[in-house]
């Protein structure tokens, strides 16, 4: 398996998606494990509902919480107020009897939040108004785009509040593609700071 | 508005098999977006889930482990209805039973699943 | 099975009374709870989901709290035709389970 990394900033939620053939993985419940050394068992953190009918409620341990889309085939899982211990290897899986399939290895990451420690100087982000609670970067493990934009949005209001923002972001990174994520918000379009950023990170 | 309709017959001998439908107006068996339940009443046991069936892109079924080796819940896509069949009943098994339609709150956002529309009940009597 | 213990069993209280019946779980449900309401001769009627959400249609003077095992259905002013008997139901475990139920009576 590739492995797909997932970048959030401490104090903040992270959000990792981890997509699947729905019809393969048909009556069949999810977990979110984490892995114990290169070669070391996968810990059980999350699991969905016990009724595979039930799956998409969201299912929380502690800070981590788990919700399953059946029919889209896709799994979500939420780690809320993410912590530098959060830092590690994980894996999504789909359970059949005391079996498990993985899904996607992820690689989570936990950057510090740089405003906590140097001027944002000239930066300029959405105000108020605009909610960065489900912003993540995305390591996705196709090949590296040729180019790279920022949605129009970062340019036009200023900042209304200490918005997270990655250690190493500037105005135009090299290799940082930002997509408009979907989100179940108000936000405007390309506003909701989904970046992915294509760098091979294959572990075969 | 969403209404159950229970229909099947009130006394079952022991042994036998309890059969009882539920026909559903305002809804469809088939929405992804809902599961389809039987209940129970009784005296000595109180209120108790017995199983439901939902359809995602296929039918899957689920059932309480009390009843497992013996329940059955089928739809009936024609008539728009589910059905249950309890096999090898005893007098244990005289309930009031209902069926229901399970729901998913929208707030909590994914957090919220309910009994929002039941049947009428029927009394179902084990008895020779 | 997850057990779903209710207190009391039965109450006896005034038209206008404050009225708070609870519900405790067995372990940890989170806020997996509903409560309904039944009448003699009548199916449940759902009045709160997911803890403390009101169901459509249900009086403001409903309302629930709680998370984890414990548990709270408050009405504010019991009204003539509050007088029922009241389930909490649980769907956090496999086995979806119910309460043994409160009998709310006139005083």
């Known amino acids: 398996h590739n492995t797909t990394v997932f970048q959030g900033v401490a104090g903040q939620s992270l959000q990792v998606s981890c997509p699947y053939d729905s019809m393969k993985h048909w009556g069949r419940r999810k977990a979110w494990c984490r892995q114990l050394g290169e070669k070391g068992p996968c810990q059980r953190v999350v699991s969905t509902h016990n009724l595979w009918l039930l799956s998409f409620l969201r299912r929380w341990n502690g800070s981590t919480a788990i919700t399953d889309d059946t029919l889209g085939g896709t799994l979500t899982i939420t780690l809320r107020n993410l912590q530098p211990h959060d830092a590690g290897l994980y894996q999504c899986q789909s359970l059949h009897g005391s079996e498990a399939d993985t899904l996607r290895k992820v690689l989570v990451e936990v950057l510090a939040d740089p405003l906590d420690h140097r001027d944002a100087g000239d930066l300029w982000f959405p105000g108020e108004s605009e909610s960065f609670e489900d912003a993540h970067v995305e390591h996705s493990i196709s090949r590296p785009s040729q180019g790279s934009h920022l949605p129009s949005c970062l340019s036009k209001e200023p900042l209304g509040r200490r918005n997270p923002l990655p250690t190493h972001f500037h105005p135009s990174p090299p290799g940082l593609h930002l997509s408009h994520q979907d989100s179940s918000s108000q936000r405007p379009l390309g506003c909701s700071l989904a970046w992915t950023e294509a760098r091979d990170t294959s572990t075969q | 508005q969403v209404q159950l309709q229970q229909s099947g017959p009130g006394l079952v001998k022991p042994s036998q098999t309890l059969s009882l439908t539920c026909a559903i107006s305002g809804d469809s068996v088939s929405s992804s977006s809902a599961a389809w339940n039987w209940i129970r009443q009784s005296p000595s046991r109180g209120l108790e889930w017995l199983g439901h069936?939902?359809?995602?892109?296929?039918?899957?079924?689920e059932y309480a482990v009390s009843v497992k080796s013996r329940i059955t819940i089928n739809p009936d896509t024609s008539k728009n209805q589910f059905s249950l069949q309890l096999n090898s009943v005893t007098p244990e098994d005289t309930a009031v039973y209902y069926c229901?339609?399970?729901?998913?709150?929208?707030?909590?956002?994914?957090?919220?699943?309910?009994?929002?529309?039941w049947g009428q009940g029927t009394l179902v009597t084990v008895s020779s | 099975d997850i057990q779903m213990t209710q207190s009391p069993s039965s109450l006896s209280a005034s038209v206008g009374d404050r009225v708070t019946i609870t519900c405790r779980a067995s372990?940890?449900?989170?806020?997996?709870l509903n409560w309904y309401q039944q009448k003699p001769g009548k199916a449940p009627k759902l009045l709160i989901y997911a803890a403390s959400n009101l169901q459509s249609g249900v009086p403001s003077r409903f309302s629930g709290s709680g998370s984890g095992t414990d548990f709270t259905l408050t009405i504010s002013s019991l009204q003539p035709e509050d007088f029922a008997t009241y389930y909490c139901?649980?769907?956090?475990?496999?086995?979806?389970?119910f309460g043994q139920g409160t009998k709310v009576e006139i005083k």
């Open positions: 229901a339609r399970g729901m998913y709150g929208s707030v909590p956002y994914k957090e919220g699943y309910y009994f929002d529309i």
């Open positions: 139901q649980q769907y956090t475990d496999e086995s979806m389970t």
């Open positions: 372990q940890g449900i989170s806020s997996d």
């Open positions: 069936i939902g359809y995602r892109s296929k039918w899957y079924n």
